[in-house]
Amino acid sequence: ESLGTEQRVVGRAAEVPGPEPGQQEQLVFGSGDAVELSCPPPGGGPMGPTVWVKDGTGLVPSERVLVGPQRLQVLNASHEDSGAYSCRQRLTQRVLCHFSVRVTDAPSSGDDEDGEDEAEDTGVDTGAPYWTRPERMDKKLLAVPAANTVRFRCPAAGNPTPSISWLKNGREFRGEHRIGGIKLRHQQWSLVMESVVPSDRGNYTCVVENKFGSIRQTYTLDVLERSPHRPILQAGLPANQTAVLGSDVEFHCKVYSDAQPHIQWLKHVEVNGSKVGPDGTPYVTVLKTAGANTTDKELEVLSLHNVTFEDAGEYTCLAGNSIGFSHHSAWLVVLPAEEELVEADEAGSVYAG
């Protein structure tokens, strides 16, 4: 939907170019002004479908609210139009532009307001609460390892200066509700919980209000715990390799483990023509294992120099810890040197890789 030029602009129009992604424009308009917000595509590239959002809710076009892909126009602005506006990619919901808009009683001077977190009661401008730093509220889900600290922020302003209160799962949340208590910083509009535990999981809502209105934001906290497990080996490693006779080869194995892992490199061998023993266990020879001066990083790489046909075969990275073992295998194919391949071709022979 494009913005028609035939739309009449009531009051003064102040069009504002969009900020760089991740930054935020803080704007003040006078009551009755036309608020125009512009969000050009980042890097001048194609924009794709976008959606304009105010205080977390998609804006519905109307006679007063004109929504376009790169521009938003709000005619005859009033207090209720104060708030946090963003232009987002429709599919990904990625924020392209942020604006903090404040509509005051006085006609605007055209100057932008300094970006301060705290609002003062000036006695002149009155208005409902609005988010001053929506970019500091982007992370709606916090996944925090147990024993660390979490901080929820809801930086806001309004006149009179709004109050802030906190809910957990929809109910009033106070310090006595958790062991270790909570720390509130009203000036920073923040709630801090130290050394989080699984019982701290839940939805946390800040409620910011004054006599002109109320806004709220909900965050979800997940507290992550360690569950002991055997080593995890990165998928796709080691990878199958094809090498020319006499060349060097490296196999890689990436190991993730809480408990200290023990890493070994094994080569599968045949004994009396058999690859496995009577109990089904493969026959292997240990090529590399932990030594006094071997680091885990060194053990994650197996280097084969000047490979021969005998080096062809199956290789296994085996990692174990106190909980169990994991292993991944890969194959090495050794091809003849190029001169031999040329001679073979001339002789009419074909080598299968």
């Epitope: 509220m137 925090v144 390892p145 024993a147 901080r151 929820f152 360690r226 809480d258």
Partner: antibody, heavy 127, light 107 residues
């Protein structure tokens, strides 16, 4: 009670190597981290690097990147600072510090706080 | 790197005095700032984190304030055990960086 004990310091020649250990106790090692900070004689504090046990990640100061490696044995609750290609300017008291994260709805960063420190171990690089 | 500049580099004060140390960051570090106290031959001790949060066990005469680039550590009534060197440190940028320190001496 949280405790951190460094060891492994000493006199080493320029170009040499040394491995410092930091034995930790009294906190959930695998959920938090260990930072290394050094202090040259009569000078201020310099952050060397950090091991974050949750994901095993490491970060280093530019002055030591490529020469120093931080690792840990979580089964022993011990962190290590492997120092290679040592220079005279690496002479300092090396401290390890328990480090926890402040996870924030402001997605720009995680703040890292070093709240418990070891007693320090002196590393002297001299010929 | 983010540069942290403390002022003054040193100051002389008496027991009972109110002491203020400032720390300025070369770029915005939000509230990601800590203050440490260090006595000669000892390890640093955390006083304040996140610019204004008093660390547990630290006396309430210590307080921190500020955000963005300008921060302050205030000791409301200096005690004999407070004579030491104080460092600010930011951890929003990589690498974490310390101020050069402020030495608080007895007048």
């Amino acid at each position: 009670e949280v405790q951190l004990v460094e060891s492994g310091g000493g006199l080493v020649q320029p170009g040499g190597s040394l491995r410092l250990s930091c034995a930790a106790s009294g906190f959930p090692f695998t959920s938090q981290g260990i930072s290394w900070v050094r202090q040259a004689p009569g000078k201020g504090l310099e952050w060397v690097g950090r091991y974050w046990a949750w994901d095993g990640s490491t970060n280093y100061a530019d002055s030591v990147k490529g020469r120093f490696t931080i690792s840990a044995d979580t089964s022993k609750n011990t962190a290590y600072l492997q120092m290679n290609s040592l220079r005279a300017e690496d002479t300092a008291v090396y401290y390890c510090a328990r480090t926890y994260g402040i996870y924030d709805t402001y997605d720009k960063y995680t703040e890292y706080v070093m709240d418990y420190w070891g007693q320090g171990t002196l590393v002297t690089v001299s010929s | 790197d983010i540069q942290m500049t403390q002022s003054p580099s040193s100051l002389s004060a008496s027991v009972g005095d109110r002491v203020t140390i400032t720390c300025r960051a070369s770029q915005d570090v939000d509230t990601s700032l800590a203050w440490y106290k260090q006595k000669p031959g000892k390890a640093p001790k955390l006083l304040i984190y996140s610019a204004s949060f008093l660390y547990s066990g630290v006396p309430s005469r210590f307080s921190g304030s500020g955000s963005g680039t300008d921060f302050t550590l205030t000791i409301s009534s200096l005690q004999p055990e407070d004579f030491a060197t104080y460092y600010c440190q930011q951890s929003t940028g990589h690498p974490q960086t310390f101020g050069q320190g402020t030495k608080v001496e007895i007048k």
